[in-house]
């Protein structure tokens, strides 16, 4: 591979990381943004970090990190933080790979325990201005009522949950339409996952490359 | 024309599990939900609950939690009901009926007994 | 859970005379969507329940006009404006405004 070669790859991994450190960035903006001006409340009181707002913020910061990282290692041609990119991809991939196995093999025990936290939070929904806020969203934004249906708020439903009498649960709903985009957000899965691995296979390669031509030059 | 078909009469021992099945025919099965209650002679009519079939919403009385459980399969437009754990209680007719926001148990099953005895 | 109090248990008509059925409700049936969800059923011997009242007042398909129904909030009547043979059986009053839906206990027509 020669310096031709070398230079094309250098500066598409840079714009490709650039365009993830914008986008990192506005995920992160907008996780901010969510955290100041809407309070979503908290759903789960036993994971109380798990606001939309966080996740927003983890998420961005994650990109961020990363393609910065990438953008860096590959525009200066430095060796530890391209291989500090690579492991970092490595990582985050394994750990998808690892998460989408167990989500596959215990959907129903975590079906069960996501039933059971949202059942608490129900039951705190009167008490706990927090709870009572994300409920409210949740119904409002998504049309739905309760977690399976209406039959959930025992002492009737709030003012949040639509009129109709009949009614579809929020989490009822939410798991259909995970169901029914299954195919969808599999293949929007594996896209991240390939250009994750691209995004390795391009940072070993420079990796490669610089130590090739430090010593074609004879550093 | 609309139509509840339910499965045949049961004869279960206590402590067993049975499985009763609706099949609708004639409308659009997943724009209903489907009812289910129970007639014990002496007893009237008691309302278990509800499922809304192609979708994972249910409504329970919560009188029967534990009890019964709903399933609907919208390939075969079967709705069905899981007693669990029978005593010579659950012994009764059961209906499947269908609900919505603009049509309310208009339309009945023929009904399944079910008899719990050692 | 909503109490459906009926009266009477049962009721003895001559063919071609008036019936009345009462319903009462141990709260509200109004939803917030402005319907009172309360039905009346028949249920002939040895067959399954059929739907004769809807929405109060609202005449089922099929269901001859000698039957009515009226009502609002917690008392509600259903009247038969002449008794026929075919009208024999139990009439049940249905609430599903409120969640456990809940039945009356029934009355029982007969034919003198």
């Known amino acids: 591979m020669g310096m031709s070669s070398l230079k094309l790859l250098k500066y598409v991994l840079f714009f490709f990381n650039l365009l993830f450190w914008i986008c990192g960035c506005c995920i992160l903006g907008f996780g901010i943004y969510l955290l100041i001006h809407n309070n979503f409340g908290v759903l789960f009181h036993n994971l109380p970090s798990l606001t939309l707002g966080n996740v927003f913020v983890i998420v961005g910061s994650i990109i961020m990190v990363v393609a910065f990282l990438g953008c860096m290692g590959s525009i200066k041609e430095n060796k530890c933080l391209l291989m500090s990119f690579f492991i970092l991809l490595l990582i985050i991939l394994l750990a998808e790979v690892t998460l989408a196995i167990l989500l596959f093999v215990y959907e129903q025990k975590l079906n069960e325990y996501v039933a059971k936290g949202l059942t608490d939070s129900i039951h705190r929904y009167h008490s706990d201005n927090s709870t009572k806020a994300a409920w409210d969203s949740i119904q409002s934004f998504l049309q739905c009522c309760g977690i399976n249906g209406t039959s959930d708020w025992t002492s009737g439903p709030p003012a949040s949950c639509p009129s109709d009498r009949k009614v579809e649960g929020c989490y009822a709903k939410a798991r259909l339409w995970f169901h029914s985009n299954f195919l969808y957000i599999g293949i929007i899965t594996i896209c991240v996952c390939v250009i994750e691995v691209l995004g390795m296979s391009f940072a070993l390669t420079l990796n490669c490359q610089i130590d090739k031509t430090s010593q074609t030059i004879g550093l | 024309q609309v139509q509840l078909q339910q499965s045949g009469t049961e004869l279960m021992k206590p402590g067993a599990s049975v499985k009763l099945s609706c099949k609708a025919t004639g409308y659009t099965f997943t724009g209903y939900w489907i009812e289910w209650v129970k007639q014990r002679p002496g007893h009237g009519l008691e309302w278990i609950g509800e499922i809304l079939p192609g979708s994972y919403s249910t409504n329970y009385n919560e009188k029967f939690k534990g009890k019964a459980t709903f399933t609907a399969d919208s390939s075969s437009n079967t709705a069905y009901m899981q007693l669990s754990s029978l005593t010579t209680e659950d012994s009764a007719i059961y209906y499947c009926?269908?609900?919505?926001?603009?049509?309310?148990?208009?339309?009945w099953g023929t009904g399944t007994t079910v008899t719990v005895s050692s | 859970d909503v109490v459906m109090t009926q009266t009477p248990l049962s009721l003895s008509v001559t063919i071609g005379q008036p019936a009345s059925i009462s319903c009462k409700s141990s709260q509200s049936l109004l939803h917030r969507d402005g319907e009172t969800y309360l039905n009346w059923l028949l249920q002939r011997p040895g067959q399954s329940p059929k739907l004769l009242i809807y929405l109060v007042s609202k005449l089922e398909s099929g269901i001859p006009d000698r039957f009515s129904g009226s009502g609002s909030g917690t008392d509600f009547t259903l009247k038969i404006s002449r008794v026929e043979v075919e009208d024999l059986g139990v009439y049940y009053c249905?609430?599903?405004?409120?969640?456990?839906?809940?039945f009356g206990s029934g009355t029982k027509l007969e034919i003198k």
């Open positions: 249905l609430q599903h405004t409120h969640f456990p839906y809940t």
């Open positions: 009926t269908r609900d919505s926001n603009y049509e309310w148990f208009d339309v």
